[in-house]
Amino acid sequence: EPPTACREKQYLINSQCCSLCQPGQKLVSDCTEFTETECLPCGESEFLDTWNRETHCHQHKYCDPNLGLRVQQKGTSETDTICTCEEGWHCTSEACESCVLHRSCSPGFGVKQIATGVSDTICEPCPVGFFSNVSSAFEKCHPWTSCETKDLVVQQAGTNKTDVVCGPQDRLR
């Protein structure tokens, strides 16, 4: 009776369990009753990092110097190239697909520590009583305006992204 499931590192095809290709190799032809799975090593600048039945290897990532990238770790037939940024620059994501001089803090966050050559900008959420309505790499959270000191009253409450809105006090007639 033909199998309905296969062991680990095998795949089911034509009612038959075939061996997967090992990392660093791609599938050329499926196994048959009489022959083993045929696999071929990935070419230069290609890789496959899992046991697979892929007919094409993946291209190594290109670390584009025009984006400030350089090779941190050269790819092999089983691993992708790892990129990093030029000294003094910082990756925009875990995958490091582009570089920034330093990141900025979004509205609602202030700069706790300005970037240096070795560390990126450190942001902190604006606490109650403070706000930031801009993206910035140097501005701290600003305190809400004190309406009382201007002999005014709060007409609209502040948030972490907006200042309070002050207005005249209602005079009793």
Partner: nanobody, 116 residues
């Protein structure tokens, strides 16, 4: 295409002054926080000064506080750095940069050499 073109560098004696300019194009200059960043020979990048889009708030590194002044003219799409009381340690290539500070937006810079 974003372009940042720095100018005004040159050779100056210790104690002298220079005014750097950065002509911006390809984006709405008045909407962006701008920075001056320098790189001394064989050294890392140092963030020198920054200014908010309206020109009302500024930042200075401790090493230049009281000597350098950053300003901007949004009508001319130009950023400035007035450098006074220059020292040998101010020798560097000075770049202007715009938020979000991507590598592609990085200008070539202008060289400032402070030497007697």
């Amino acid at each position: 295409e974003v372009q940042l073109l720095e100018s005004g560098g040159g050779l100056v004696q210790p104690g002298g002054s220079l005014r750097l300019s950065c002509a911006a194009s390809g984006f709405t200059f008045r909407d962006y926080e701008m920075w001056w960043v320098r790189q001394a020979p064989g050294k890392g990048l140092e963030r020198v000064s920054a200014i908010n889009p309206q020109g009302t708030r500024t930042y200075y590194a401790d090493s230049v506080k009281g000597r350098f002044t950053i300003s901007r003219d949004n009508s001319k799409n130009t950023l400035y750095l007035q450098m006074n009381s220059l020292r040998a340690e101010d020798t560097a290539v000075y770049h202007c940069a715009k938020l979000p500070f991507t590598f592609e937006d990085w200008g070539q810079g202008t060289l400032v050499t402070v030497s007697s």
